[in-house]
Interface confidence: medium
């Protein structure tokens, strides 16, 4: 298991919510990405190859998410101070072998200007 801080901008704020960006290498074909808040699993997304060109995307702990060819974005809404915490992207790579797990993360700071529905 590889641990480290994200070397990219992991948190993108908009409209009182936050997009948490979890990147993976674009050679990865099949994987599971979990979003952890502290040690708690908030969200997950699994991408697997299927018959022919088919692909299966499944979530056991569903969050609004967006998949690209090198990242999964998880969206958290209605931010408040309780959202401030360490968040980790826990990537399990199934394909290409060998099986590997990487953990990257950072601290989500919540400032008044980022909270939902603040009067400007």
């Amino acid at each position: 298991e590889i641990n480290g801080s994200a070397n990219y901008e992991m948190f993108i704020f908009h409209n009182g919510g936050v997009q948490i960006l979890c990147k993976y290498p674009d050679i990865v074909q099949q994987f599971k990405m979990q979003l952890l808040k502290g040690g708690q699993i908030l969200c997950d997304l699994t991408k697997t190859k299927g018959s022919g060109n088919t692909v299966s995307i499944k979530s056991l702990k569903f969050c609004h998410s967006q998949l690209s060819n090198n990242s999964v974005s998880f969206f958290l809404y209605n931010l408040d101070h309780s959202h401030a915490n360490y968040y980790f992207c826990n990537l399990s790579i199934f394909d290409p072998p060998p099986f590997k797990v990487t953990l990257t993360g950072g601290y989500l700071h919540i400032y008044e200007s980022q909270l939902c529905c603040q009067l400007k």
Epitope: T48, G50, S51, G52, T54, S56
Partner: antibody, heavy 124, light 108 residues
Framework: EVQLVESGGGVVRPGGSLRLSCVAS????????MSWVRQAPGKGLEWVSG????????DYSDSVKGRFTISRDNAKNSLYLQMNSLRAEDTALYYC?????????????????WGQGILVTVSS | EIVLTQSPGTLSLSPGERATLSCRAS???????LAWYQQKRGQAPRLLIY???SRATGIPDRFSGDGSGTDFTLSISRLEPEDFAVYYC?????????FGPGTKVDIK
């Protein structure tokens, strides 16, 4: 024990239609992609079509594209193959087969479980 | 599409002998997405090997797979009477998935 049982085969004239069904038991059906594979009499195996776990993604071999439609109903643990504009060369034993995810990971492998096959004969 | 060629077409051997079956792909099968199936007369195919070399659940260790890229082999170390059948290789890397024409292993 996983069981896949096909039905709906028979004799049909060229240009006609058939709908094959495959019912799965002993498995959490919506955990898996599924495929149809066929075998002409005395010949080898040919992959026909595949579908992902929720029916949102499908794929076809060039030989059936535009004529066959794969679908599934997870509530009924069922896989289907609607076959239109049938030709003599579609005559075969049709198997449904389950996609498999290997040893503790999601490393993809077709096909670990197969039905017993259902015969489709296209003849005038 | 990836065309798979198997050789020999027929292999005549006695029980206890070693069988070596070959499968060649017309282009590289990346990530070793190659499987082997056994089919006996009147039965559905049975998965033996996936990922070129991983044995499927319940498959005896006399079956082994090897190879990468375009050249793959299935070996049966000591043929048992129940091993006489047709063997197909299968690539599941690129759509359309394709199968080889098969190698028949029969009793000499």
């Amino acid at each position: 024990e996983v069981q896949l049982v096909e039905s709906g085969g028979g004799v049909v004239r060229p240009g006609g239609s058939l709908r094959l069904s495959c019912v799965a038991s002993g498995v959490t059906f919506d955990d898996y992609g599924m495929s149809w594979v066929r075998q002409a009499p005395g010949k080898g195996l040919e992959w026909v079509s595949g579908i992902n776990w929720n029916g949102g993604d499908t794929d076809y071999s060039d030989s059936v594209k535009g004529r066959f439609t794969i679908s599934r109903d997870n509530a009924k643990n069922s896989l289907y193959l609607q076959m239109n504009s049938l030709r003599a060369e579609d005559t075969a034993l049709y198997y449904c087969a389950r996609d498999f995810y290997g040893s503790g990971s999601y490393y993809h492998v077709p096909f670990d479980y197969w039905g017993q096959g259902i015969l489709v004969t296209v003849s005038s | 599409e990836i065309v798979l060629t198997q050789s020999p077409g027929t292999l005549s051997l006695s029980p206890g002998e070693r069988a070596t079956l070959s499968c060649r792909a017309s282009q590289s099968v990346s990530r070793s997405y190659l499987a082997w199936y056994q089919q006996k007369r009147g039965q559905a195919p049975r998965l033996l090997i996936y990922g070129a070399s991983s044995r499927a659940t319940g498959i005896p260790d006399r079956f082994s797979g090897d190879g990468s890229g375009t050249d793959f082999t299935l070996s049966i170390s000591r043929l048992e009477p129940e091993d006489f059948a047709v063997y197909y290789c299968h690539q599941y890397d690129m759509s359309p998935f394709t199968f080889g024409p098969g190698t028949k292993v029969d009793i000499k």
